[in-house]
């Protein structure tokens, strides 16, 4: 028969022969022959291959370096890489999570819209009218101004995005 020019899924063409790819978690030791199936070997400890492949070396699991603020979120297997995340209070600098930076704090006048996670930074938003934040924080949302009326008080000093209103007693003379 004519030698093949293309092979089925999960096969590869080598020296005019279609050979089976190695399954995830295994590496190629030797190509198939007309008489022998593809030789594959399981990846070693701390190694992985996550696709059907013809790789002769497995990939090393990612190392979550504590010196870079990293810790293991999910331990790798022979078929999956280790997933790193950042220590509490830190987040990844990239999607690959190769290093961490301290969560950003929202300055006075800004509140936390979304608290940071191991993979995303704090999202801040300006405090709208009626709200304020007087601290630099990675957790505090904008607080609503105090409602003087509900306390039978009047506004003595208007609030800003950084300060609360100041309430005072009602001016009895105006009664």
């Amino acid at each position: 028969p004519e030698p093949p020019t293309a092979c089925r899924e999960k096969q590869y063409l080598i020296n005019s022969q279609c050979c089976s790819l190695c399954q995830p978690g295994q590496k190629l030791v030797s190509d198939c022959t007309e008489f022998t199936e593809t030789e594959c070997l399981p990846c070693g400890e701390s190694e992985f291959l996550d696709t059907w492949n013809r790789e002769t070396h497995c990939h090393q699991h990612k190392y979550c370096d504590p010196n870079l603020g990293l810790r293991v979120q999910q331990k790798g297997t022979s078929e999956t890489d280790t997933i790193c995340t950042c220590e509490e209070g830190w987040h990844c600098t990239s999607e690959a999570c190769e290093s961490c930076v301290l969560h950003r704090s929202c300055s006075p006048g800004f509140g936390v819209k979304q608290i940071a996670t191991g993979v995303s930074d704090t999202i801040c938003e300006p405090c709208p009218v009626g709200f304020f934040s007087n601290v630099s924080s990675a957790f505090e949302k904008c607080h609503p101004w105090t409602s003087c009326e509900t306390k039978d008080l009047v506004v003595q000093q208007a609030g800003t995005n950084k300060t609360d209103v100041v309430c005072g007693p009602q001016d009895r003379l105006r009664a």
Epitope: N15, S30, T33, E34, F35, T36, E37
Partner: antibody
Framework: QVQLVESGGGVVQPGRSLRLSCAAS????????MHWVRQAPGKGLEWVAV????????YYADSVKGRFTISRDNSKNTLYLQMNSLRAEDTAVYYC??????????WGQGTMVTVSS | EIVLTQSPGTLSLSPGERATLSCRAS???????LAWYQQKPGQAPRLLIY???SRANGIPDRFSGSGSGTDFTLTISRLEPEDFAVYYC??????????FGGGTKVEIK
């Protein structure tokens, strides 16, 4: 460890039969093609036969075609060579060897077959 | 059928010397699927080189293979006492039959 051990050799008269066995261990036998190779006393290596991993494909050297049959039992991790109508020129050490894309990478220690009246 | 011719038939050398063994094919060997085997008296052959130039597992780097097409060479850079043996080349791509060369005996001078 990976090992092939041949057995079944001996002295036999011309025209008679003999069956050689090759016991495999230390690897997944059912995934590998297997060969028989022989070596007459003081001579070089001569390929005899090959069988595919599942036993479907078989090829023979012209010198043994029609007289020798290669077979395997994957459940027993064993390769066989049935030798009929033996001749004096079949006298040799018979080796089994594992087939790979790297050539014959593992060989047994051999079993001696002597055809003599 | 490919015929493999090995030369010389015998090579007489001293330990420490360089050995150069030749294997010539009657037609081109497909994909350079050519192997070299070492055989010592009373022992089975041992795979040394495959794919014309790749060393098999555990083979010392003093053994090297080269060549393609019809001309192949096995070189032993510095002969050790345990290297004195018979060496065979073999074509394992163009079958049937699988062919072996006639062998080269490397003996102590």
């Amino acid at each position: 460890q990976v090992q092939l051990v041949e057995s079944g050799g001996g002295v036999v008269q011309p025209g008679r039969s003999l069956r050689l066995s090759c016991a495999a261990s230390g690897f997944t036998f059912e995934k590998y093609g297997m060969h028989w190779v022989r070596q007459a006393p003081g001579k070089g290596l001569e390929w005899v036969a090959v069988i595919s991993y599942e036993g479907e494909k078989k090829y023979y050297a012209d010198s043994v075609k029609g007289r020798f049959t290669i077979s395997r039992d994957n459940s027993k991790n064993t390769l066989y060579l049935q030798m009929n109508s033996l001749r004096a020129e079949d006298t040799a050490v018979y080796y089994c060897a594992r087939d790979t894309s790297r050539g014959h990478d593992i060989w047994g220690q051999g079993t001696m077959v002597t055809v003599s009246s | 059928e490919i015929v493999l011719t090995q030369s010389p038939g015998t090579l007489s050398l001293s330990p420490g010397e360089r050995a150069t063994l030749s294997c010539r094919a009657s037609q081109s060997v497909s994909y350079s699927y050519l192997a070299w085997y070492q055989q010592k008296p009373g022992q089975a052959p041992r795979l040394l080189i495959y794919g014309a130039s790749s060393r098999a597992n555990g083979i010392p780097d003093r053994f090297s293979g080269s060549g393609s097409g019809t001309d192949f060479t096995l070189t032993i850079s510095r002969l050790e006492p345990e290297d004195f043996a018979v060496y065979y080349c073999s074509d394992y791509a163009d079958y049937p039959p699988f062919t072996f060369g006639g062998g080269t005996k490397v003996e102590i001078k």
